[in-house]
């Protein structure tokens, strides 16, 4: 999704709400654009997961390890 006139109007916007599993909303984000390596400044952002940078939004998102949820994969999924 390399449209050069696209605005990062969701710059700073994270995937999902605090109660959502970021891994799920990352899939939704993929329709809007592809991912790149997270900037180094976000290396500690995702607690139990890995960071991906949403190119269209210019913001980090987390793909949680199994059994973890939350924007930063910071919570144990009690239903896992």
């Amino acid at each position: 999704d390399g449209n050069s006139t696209r605005s990062p109007e969701t710059n700073g916007l994270l995937c999902g709400d605090p109660e959502e599993n970021c891994a799920a909303t990352t899939t939704q984000s993929k329709r809007k654009g592809h991912f790149s390596r997270c900037p180094k400044q976000y290396k500690h952002y995702c607690i139990k997961g890995r960071c991906r940078f949403v190119v269209a939004e210019q913001t980090p998102s987390c793909v949680c390890d199994e059994g973890y949820i939350g924007a930063r994969c910071e919570r144990v999924d009690l239903f896992y």
Epitope: P8, N11, L13, L14, S36
Partner: antibody, heavy 116, light 106 residues
């Protein structure tokens, strides 16, 4: 339209404290990272700090680490910067800006002067 | 920390000129680079993000290019409202700005 309005600047003595506020409107504040960026008189831009959407993740420039604290109140659509142990070199216009990586909307800035 | 070096620090140009400003990072930042325009007494305005993507509402005479360590902002035909100071900013390893390039009327 997106608006960011800083307040709380003023004259303070070295070693003193000040709390800046940034009132946001025109967008869903609780979904965005927000930053503070400053500019000393006649100088360039310097990133100060950012905070993520829910206030769980913050970072600071080395020059302010341990002295400044960023926070937010999503119920009030407001960002804060608590500045302690202020130094002459902290004199600058302080801008709040939307975003953590790059900054697509900026406030008009508030001037902080640290002088005896 | 990553240092950003802009050149030139200032330049004089005329309306209609093609203007090029360069920015060099002290280490590779992929394409994590933005360009801003600032006029005296005003807040900066985002022009370009991700090295080459034009921010919404910004005239198409502005363009950005580069990746890794070397980046360029080009104004294809300078307009009266373009006289300002321009800053690059990397956002790979924290957020650091170049020292600025002042574009003045010749």
């Amino acid at each position: 339209q997106v608006q960011l309005l800083e307040s709380g600047g003023g004259l303070v003595q070295p070693g003193g404290s000040l709390r800046l506020s940034c009132a946001a409107s025109g967008f869903t504040f609780s979904r965005y990272w927000i930053s503070w960026v400053r500019q000393a008189p006649g100088k360039g831009l310097e990133w100060v700090s950012y905070i993520d959407s829910w206030g769980s993740y913050t970072n600071y420039a080395d020059s302010v680490k341990g002295r400044f604290t960023i926070s937010r109140d999503n119920s009030k659509n407001t960002l804060y910067l608590q500045m302690n142990s202020l130094r002459a070199e902290d004199t600058a216009v302080y801008y709040c800006a939307r975003g953590g990586s790059l900054f697509d909307y900026w406030g008009q800035g508030t001037l902080v002067t640290v002088s005896s | 920390d990553i240092q950003m070096t802009q050149s030139p620090s200032s330049l004089s140009a005329s309306v209609g000129d093609r203007v090029t400003i360069t920015c060099r990072a002290s280490q590779g930042i992929i394409s994590y680079l933005g360009w801003y325009q600032q006029k005296p007494g005003k807040a900066p305005k985002l022009l370009i993000y991700a090295a080459s993507s034009l921010q919404s509402g910004v005239p198409s005479r502005f363009s950005g290019s580069g990746s890794g360590t070397d980046f360029t902002l080009t104004i294809s035909s300078l307009q009266p409202e373009d006289f300002a100071t321009y800053y690059c900013q990397q956002y790979d390893d924290w957020d650091t700005f170049g020292q600025g390039t002042k574009v003045e009327i010749k």
